[in-house]
Interface confidence: low
């Protein structure tokens, strides 16, 4: 079977499985709610609104071929750092081996020269990245682990030739604000690649990322906040210089709100993020003073 054909087949199988898995999860959640006869929990957050267009001086991030519409993100997991997510395994584990194999097939073929020469390559790479990020939240830990390794391999192999596309796909996952594991997988990788964004793209990325980071800061999961706090210094070191005073204040306010959290982890990560936002702004001293005044105001 030709490389491209193998790739498409793996794409289709994996995509349909992941959609089916998400539907099953939603059904199971609904059944559990009905069985418990309790008032239903708040619905999952709606897909994030379309980001505002960058201001005139900023360019769009990249021309985007239309990927298939992503399935709706599952609701965020519990606000617990340690407890793993429990999901019923019936019917899903039957194809665990297939999912691992599909990930490996995609991983192997997306870096193959024959696929890289294809006029469809940018689109295929986008789908591959989306699927690996989806699989980062698979119910089976070994599928998650393989997906994680695949993301690392693909990024390493294609960094020289396709860095802007890789950055864009990771950004799109952050923007999606979906499952905690997928979000974390995208966040830390985007942060690692942020310093490689071309200077003319830094302002557009900053403008588009600000609402995402603000939204992520509102997530209840401690694990997400940990990853966000590790990512913010790297993202701000790359883009902080391109932010105006108002944008810095909006971001700071989001983290200041977390200082009132009942979770010590969320309070600590918020404090670290706020400090690094000031540190990497254009007016470091001004924002340190501004932050200090706001904090003193909270104490009064």
């Amino acid at each position: 079977m030709a490389t491209l054909e193998k790739l498409m087949k793996a794409f289709e199988s994996l995509k349909s499985f992941q959609q089916q898995q998400q539907q099953q999860q939603q059904q199971q959640q609904q059944q559990q709610q009905q069985q418990q006869q309790q008032p239903p929990p708040p619905p999952p957050p709606p897909p994030p609104p379309q980001l505002p267009q960058p201001p005139p001086q900023a360019q769009p991030l990249l021309p985007q071929p239309q990927p298939p519409p992503p399935p709706p993100p599952p609701p965020p997991g519990p606000a617990v750092a340690e407890e793993p997510l429990h999901r019923p395994k019936k019917e899903l584990s039957a194809t665990k081996k297939d999912r691992v194999n599909h990930c490996l097939t995609i991983c192997e073929n997306i870096v193959a020269q024959s696929v890289r020469n294809s006029p469809e390559f940018q689109k295929l790479l986008g789908i591959a990245m989306e699927l690996f990020l989806l699989c980062s939240d698979d119910a089976e830990s070994d599928v998650r682990m393989v997906a994680d390794e695949c993301l690392n391999k693909v990024i390493k192999a294609l960094m020289d030739s396709n860095l802007p596309r890789l950055q864009l796909e990771l950004y799109k996952e952050i923007k999606k604000n979906g499952a905690p594991r997928s979000l974390r997988a995208a966040l830390w990788r985007f942060a690692e690649l942020a310093h490689l964004v071309r200077p003319q793209k830094c302002r557009p990325y900053l403008v588009n990322l600000l609402p995402c980071l603000t939204r992520t800061s509102k997530r209840p999961e401690e694990s997400v906040q940990e990853t966000l706090a590790a990512a913010v210094p790297k993202i701000m070191a790359s883009f902080g210089n391109f932010a105006n005073d108002n944008e810095i204040k909006v971001l700071l306010k989001a983290f200041i709100a977390n200082l009132k959290s009942s979770s010590p982890t969320i309070r600590r990560t918020a404090a670290g993020s706020a400090v690094s936002i000031c540190q990497h702004s254009r007016r470091t001293q001004y924002f340190y003073s501004w932050l200090l005044n706001v904090l003193l105001g909270l104490l009064v």
Epitope: D142, R189, E226
Partner: antibody, heavy 123, light 107 residues
Framework: QVQLQESGPGLVKPSQTLSLTCTVS??????????WSWIRQPAGKRLEWIGR???????NYNPSLESRVTISLDTSNNQFSLKLTSLTAADTAVYYC???????????????WGQGTLVTVSS | DIQMTQSPSSLSASVGDRVTITCRAS??????LNWYRQKPGKAPQLVIY???SLQSEVPSRFSGSGSGPEFTLTISSLQPEDFATYYC?????????FGQGTKLEIK
């Protein structure tokens, strides 16, 4: 290839403080992907988890050692370290540094280990 | 803390034998159970993670099963390099805890 290497004194006096460093190659200790851990093993006994650190300086310690332990990161040298205070003979063990594997931070195995360093507490 | 108990504590077997080691957790840990092999003077090496997933480069004669409180590690046909001490470890929560070990010796 990820490699971890422990370094520090082989002999420490009782009541003193043990300082060990783990130097990492092939991975970045500042990456939001991993937890960096310390484990020890007294001769002929089971492995004992000491604690772990995350790049945001978040730490988890074994409650049995918490009052005496500090684990920290040195991102500029790509290292992480262990400090254990008020040593007694019971702290004599082989000390290992390790990395929790990526993919599922909430329940990850220790996929990479250093070769271990023997620490003897004796006057 | 979650207590991990392995049985047997030691086991004598011959090359080619099939052996099974059991690990029991003091509370529910789902499938967050890892197995390590340790040879004298060496660091532990991951063999099985998440109860049943084989770590890359570990031979397929190793397999793991179980969920909840009870887990097993099986070696289908012992090879000379398999004689070592095996530890189970829960990664369900912190503090991470290990079993006391099962020493596998040549009969």
């Amino acid at each position: 290839q990820v490699q971890l290497q422990e370094s520090g004194p082989g002999l420490v006096k009782p009541s003193q403080t043990l300082s060990l460093t783990c130097t990492v190659s092939g991975a970045s200790v500042s990456s939001g992907a991993y937890y960096w851990s310390w484990i020890r093993q007294p001769a002929g006994k089971r492995l004992e988890w000491i604690g772990r650190v995350y790049p945001t300086w978040s730490t988890n310690y074994n409650p049995s050692l918490e009052s005496r332990v500090t684990i920290s990161l040195d991102t500029s040298n790509n290292q992480f370290s262990l400090k254990l205070t008020s040593l007694t003979a019971a702290d004599t063990a082989v000390y290992y540094c390790a990395r929790e594997a990526p993919g599922d931070y909430d329940a990850a195995p220790l996929a990479y280990w250093g070769q271990g360093t023997l620490v003897t507490v004796s006057s | 803390d979650i207590q991990m108990t392995q049985s047997p504590s030691s086991l004598s077997a011959s090359v080619g034998d099939r052996v099974t080691i059991t690990c029991r957790a003091s509370q529910y840990i789902s499938h967050y159970l890892n197995w390590y092999r340790q040879k004298p003077g060496k660091a532990p090496q991951l063999v099985i993670y998440a109860a049943s997933s084989l770590q890359s480069e570990v031979p397929s004669r190793f397999s793991g099963s179980g969920s909840g409180p009870e887990f097993t590690l099986t070696i289908s046909s012992l090879q000379p390099e398999d004689f070592a001490t095996y530890y189970c470890q829960q990664s369900y929560t912190t503090p991470r805890t290990f079993g006391q070990g099962t020493k596998l010796e040549i009969k």
